[in-house]
């Protein structure tokens, strides 16, 4: 989380009630989408 334009953390931890599907559907940046796929790989 964090909520700032200068934060370096890109949603490192899932927030409450947040799923991988919701992250995928709301991801805007390349970094966020990379993190989504990182989670997918790690869950295999």
């Amino acid at each position: 989380g964090g909520g700032g334009s200068k934060h370096k953390c890109f949603r490192k931890d899932l927030e409450q009630n947040e799923t991988l599907e919701s992250i995928m559907s709301t991801a805007e940046s390349e970094e966020e989408l990379k993190r989504y796929f990182y989670y997918l790989e790690g869950s295999k």
Partner: antibody, heavy 119, light 107 residues
Framework: QVQLVQSGGGVVQPGRSLRLSCAAS????????MHWVRQAPGKGLEWVAV????????HYSDSVKGRFTISRDDSKNTLYLQMNSLRAEDTAVYYC????????????WGQGTLVTVSS | DIQMTQSPSSLSASVGDRVTITCRAS??????LAWFQQKPGKAPKSLIY???SLQSGVPSKFSGSGSGTDFTLTISSLQPEDFATYYC?????????FGGGTKVEIK
């Protein structure tokens, strides 16, 4: 430095179409989502649409859903808003805006372009 | 949708005054709140993100506070260049929504 330069506004009749452009420079355009926000004359700000990196995700406000289409051309570092079936209530200054990701605040805005829908 | 209610809608103040603007969200938005300043005919300027963090280059006379549903923007000592309209915005979820604005005018 980051620049967002807009073009494409003008006067258009109700029911017609118009396409707005936002040319980006000074940052890695292809890596970030981009937004459109509008402001009717004398009124407040209204979020219109967002397109993600690679165009994977698109979201629209209910007021423009089904009529407006957001798109991007990363080879030209340009964001677009295709506006169809325009209505008088779409008359506004349209701004493009950048942010670093979902749940991040806008850090840069375009200069705005006026769209007037009138017969 | 999350409604953002700003108050007051307008205020008159003098140079040197301390000014406080409030913004209330219809549901909790954690600290996903930004403040913008807008002058006539100009694009909004980002002042504060994350409810309390100053954007780069913004003077420290601007400060923000709050979390959850209630937020404030404070200008510690109003200067002539600060007379403008101020907007809050939640970016917790789509659709992103703005407050109705607060016009700060010269008394």
């Amino acid at each position: 430095q980051v620049q967002l330069v807009q073009s494409g506004g003008g006067v258009v009749q109700p029911g017609r179409s118009l396409r707005l452009s936002c040319a980006a420079s000074g940052f890695s355009f292809s890596s970030f989502g981009m937004h459109w926000v509008r402001q009717a004359p004398g009124k407040g700000l209204e979020w219109v649409a967002v397109i993600s990196y690679g165009g994977i995700n698109k979201h629209y406000s209910d007021s423009v859903k089904g009529r407006f289409t957001i798109s991007r051309d990363d080879s030209k570092n340009t964001l677009y808003l295709q506006m169809n079936s325009l209505r008088a209530e779409d008359t506004a200054v349209y701004y493009c805006a950048k942010r670093e990701g979902y749940r991040y605040a806008y850090d840069y805005w375009g200069q705005g372009t006026l769209v007037t829908v009138s017969s | 949708d999350i409604q953002m209610t700003q108050s007051p809608s307008s205020l008159s103040a003098s140079v040197g005054d301390r000014v406080t603007i409030t913004c209330r969200a219809s549901q909790g938005i954690s600290n996903y709140l930004a403040w913008f300043q807008q002058k006539p005919g100009k694009a909004p300027k980002s002042l504060i993100y994350g409810a309390s963090s100053l954007q780069s280059g913004v003077p420290s006379k601007f400060s923000g506070s709050g979390s959850g549903t209630d937020f404030t923007l404070t200008i510690s000592s109003l200067q002539p260049e600060d007379f403008a309209t101020y907007y809050c915005q939640q970016y917790n979820s789509y659709p992103l929504t703005f407050g109705g604005g607060t016009k700060v005018e010269i008394k």
